[in-house]
Interface confidence: low
């Protein structure tokens, strides 16, 4: 086969139909889409294209200029009357810039063979396109059979002489793709076998997924894969002031479209998304977490003077627990409970109240009962101690009532009902409580425990004792029961308002059993244990006043 190297066809004046064709064609040439990167666009080359034709009388370049006097590179061939045409047009070396799949867009016109007189046997309406890969920019001295055919190109629209007269140019656009490419560049070749063609423009490009910011992640320009069905996974990087739980990824399709986003970036705490960037929260606003969409106004009773705040500072006298979410208003301790009332039943007290007028802005209000036992004479109060029972409990009360049992009878108590909430322990302020003063009812007194013998004679015994430990009211009187030992059914009762008595009319040298009990308005207490004392014989002197064991 003949070599295609070293051949060059000098430009000649083009026939009228080509010029008409160009004028129409130029108006249709549009800018390339953003996902296409041109490797060659014959329309934009200002100087010599450097293409070669073989044989020299085959393809010829038509030198035209556009309205800005920029050259227009058009190649034509129209050897329709001659047989066995084999006209080649070779491009210069085209770098593939790392792309493994490229696209060739041809814009051309083709004469309808039926409109050409006498050439029906030799006229063709197709041409062929080939390519040859090479790392060598000066490697055009190759044989025809080394080129790989891309496709036979046919026109969708051919034109006739009539069209020329009407100046209606039928420009064809055909796109073919080639891949996978493995070398740094390639040559294209166009083979005419006897058609009437004007090759108006050749654009060689690859497709990329253009750099994009999606979900606050930047994805770089990405050249599409070699396979038309291939999806390339591309990692994105988060924009300034953003973070991610799951690294952002997208897939670049063979058509240069971004598909199937995975993961996303979020503006970090203190920043919010605006126009695809992360902007600081302005003073008075905050964002506590990347998972929150936008900055929020500081909640009630809090503020921030800073940009990029992740939380707001509570105003004076307002607080926030560590467990309170930052979106929650700052709160304060509650005011005191109100309208406390008491109901006394012997040694039990039932307290009831209504909630504080100001809960401090919280729902976790509970109540604590402080119990103080007060001495009305000394004006002193002391803690009640552990014997008092609280129903249901003393602290953490949710209901507005409580029952205290096992109180001392006939005793002055002060109960402080304190309202507390989740921030009470954070506040240095005074406790908020309402006081209720109550006096428990009188009850039967406890037993007399401490009895001393006084003067003992042959016919009488004098005794003294202390008031019961728990008088449970005002002692009205004491009842003293005594009998001669082993004569229990024959007893005597003496009543006394004092804590001393003398039992008279007793037998000398006899043992007597004494029991004492006290009475209040609530009734008698139980008798004391038995105390035994012996009258003296007729001859003995009085005994001392020693303590009974």
């Amino acid at each position: 086969p003949a070599s295609l190297a070293g051949c060059y066809s000098a430009p000649r004046r083009a026939p009228l139909w080509t010029c008409l064709l160009l004028c129409a064609a130029l108006r249709t040439l549009l800018a390339s889409p953003s996902n296409e990167v041109n490797l060659l666009d014959s329309r934009t080359v200002m100087g010599d294209l450097g293409w070669i034709a073989f044989p020299k009388n085959g393809w010829e370049e038509i030198g035209e200029v556009d309205e800005n006097y920029a050259p227009i590179h058009t190649y034509q061939v129209c050897k329709v009357m001659e047989q066995n045409q084999n006209n080649w047009l070779l491009t210069s070396w085209i770098s593939n810039e790392g792309a493994s799949r490229i696209f060739i867009e041809l814009k051309f016109t083709l004469r309808d063979c039926n409109s050409l007189p006498g050439g029906l046997g030799t006229c063709k309406e197709t041409f062929n396109m080939y390519y040859f890969e090479s790392d060598d920019q000066n490697g055009r001295n190759i044989k025809e059979n080394q080129y790989i055919k891309i496709d036979t190109i046919a026109a969708d629209e051919s034109f006739t002489e009539l069209d020329l007269g009407d100046r209606v140019m039928k420009l064809n656009t055909e796109v073919r793709d080639v891949g996978p490419l493995s070398k740094k560049g390639f040559y294209l070749a166009f083979q005419d076998v006897g058609a009437c063609i004007a090759l108006v423009s050749v654009r060689v490009y690859y497709k990329k997924c253009p750099s994009v910011v999606r979900h606050l992640a930047v994805f770089p320009d990405t050249i599409t894969g070699a396979d038309s069905s291939q999806l390339l996974e591309v990692s994105g990087s988060c924009v300034n002031h953003s973070v991610t739980d799951e690294p952002p990824k997208m897939h670049c399709s063979a058509e240069g479209e971004w598909l199937v986003p995975i993961g996303k970036c979020m503006c970090k705490a203190g920043y919010e998304e605006k126009n695809g960037t992360c902007q600081v929260c302005r003073p008075g606003f905050f964002k506590a977490s990347p998972h929150i969409q936008s900055c929020g106004k500081c909640p009630p009773h809090s503020y921030t003077h800073e940009e990029a705040s992740t939380s707001c500072v509570c105003e004076k006298d307002y607080f926030r627990r560590e467990s309170d979410p930052p979106t929650m208003a700052c709160t304060r301790p509650p005011s005191a409970p109100r309208n406390a009332i008491s109901n006394v039943n012997e040694t039990s007290v039932f307290l009831e109240w209504i909630p504080p007028a100001d809960t401090g802005g919280r729902k976790d209000v509970s109540y604590y009962i402080a119990c103080k036992k007060c001495n009305s004479h000394a004006g002193v109060c002391e803690e009640c101690g552990g014997h008092v029972r609280y129903l249901p409990r003393q602290s953490g009360l949710k209901n507005t009532s409580v029952m205290m049992v096992d109180l001392l009878a006939h005793t002055n108590y002060t109960f402080e009902i304190e309202a507390v909430n989740g921030v009470s322990d954070l506040s240095p302020g005074a406790r908020q409580y309402v006081s209720v003063n109550v006096t428990t009812n009188q009850a039967a007194p406890s037993p007399v425990t401490n009895v001393k013998k006084g003067k003992i004679a042959k016919n009488s015994i004098s005794l003294s004792w202390q008031e019961p430990d728990r008088p449970n009211g005002i002692i009205l009187e004491y009842e003293i029961k005594y009998f001669e030992k082993d004569q229990e059914t024959s007893y005597t009762i003496i009543k006394s308002k004092e804590t001393t008595i003398t039992a008279e009319g007793l037998k000398p040298a006899s043992v007597y059993v004494f029991q004492i009990r006290a009475r209040t308005a609530a009734g008698y207490g139980v008798f004391s244990r038995r105390f035994e004392f012996e009258t003296t014989p007729v001859f003995a002197a009085s005994s001392d006043q020693s303590q009974i064991p």
């Epitope: 003077h305 004076k316 006298d317 560590e322 240095p428 302020g429």
Partner: antibody
Framework: QVQLVESGGGLVQPGGSLRLSCAAS????????MSWVRQAPGKGLEWVSA????????YYADSVKGRFTISRDNSKNTLYLQMNSLRAEDTAVYYC?????????WGQGTLVTVSS | SYELIQPPSVSVAPGQTARITCGGS??????VHWYQQKPGQAPVLVVY???DRPSGIPERFSGSNSGNTATLTISRVEAGDEADYYC??????????VFGGRTKVTVL
């Protein structure tokens, strides 16, 4: 009753380090923020550092930031002040204080002298 | 950073009233605490949160706070009130406790 007892003071050369401790008792230590306050001889009170009850937040005066570290061990009811790169102007009595009611309990202080 | 200004000294006759001022920008928006310190002793809180008294502090000690000035008032001054006094606030913009300079109260 509430008691705060500082220890760890003494004489140290410029550039040296000391660690002060403050043992607390008589109150729920982990519920309250704590501070270190110092007083140079014949001078007024100067706040040094503070720490929240949980230990999660710490605060420092500009004069000690980067040199002193406040910490606490709530299991031991103890507050610490690690002092590095000491200077002559750090000479003072160092007090620890609670903030139960804005600093209403103070220790008796421990003297730190920085001198060559 | 936030600054508190106190007079260096205040003199008062026994039984009279002593007033110690503490000046600071918009101090009324802050909680002011007052400390008393006697020679060789640790400071003692005498007023907190502008005007509250801890238990055990006599009613003669009172506080107020308005505008740009907080005031500690000691009425019916006694010889035992002779001491250094300090005001203190928490400055939330710098996250610092701030003490005023000391005021020496002398009972004549």
């Amino acid at each position: 009753q509430v008691q705060l007892v500082e220890s760890g003071g003494g004489l140290v050369q410029p550039g040296g380090s000391l660690r002060l401790s403050c043992a607390a008792s008589g109150f729920t230590f982990s519920s309250y923020a704590m501070s270190w306050v110092r007083q140079a001889p014949g001078k007024g009170l100067e706040w040094v550092s503070a720490i929240s009850g949980s230990g999660g937040s710490t605060y420092y005066a500009d004069s000690v930031k980067g040199r002193f570290t406040i910490s606490r061990d709530n299991s031991k009811n103890t507050l610490y002040l690690q002092m590095n790169s000491l200077r002559a102007e750090d000479t003072a009595v160092y007090y620890c204080a609670t903030h139960a009611a804005a600093g209403d309990y103070w220790g008796q202080g421990t003297l730190v002298t920085v001198s060559s | 950073s936030y600054e508190l200004i106190q007079p260096p000294s205040v003199s008062v006759a026994p039984g009279q009233t002593a007033r110690i001022t503490c000046g600071g920008s918009n101090i009324r928006s802050k909680s002011v605490h007052w400390y008393q310190q006697k020679p060789g002793q640790a400071p003692v809180l005498v007023v907190y949160d502008d005007s509250d008294r801890p238990s055990g502090i006599p009613e003669r000690f009172s506080g107020s706070n308005s505008g740009n000035t907080a005031t500690l008032t000691i009425s019916r001054v006694e010889a035992g009130d002779e001491a250094d006094y300090y005001c203190q606030v928490w400055d939330s913009s710098s996250d610092h406790w701030v003490f005023g300079g000391r005021t020496k109260v002398t009972v004549l």
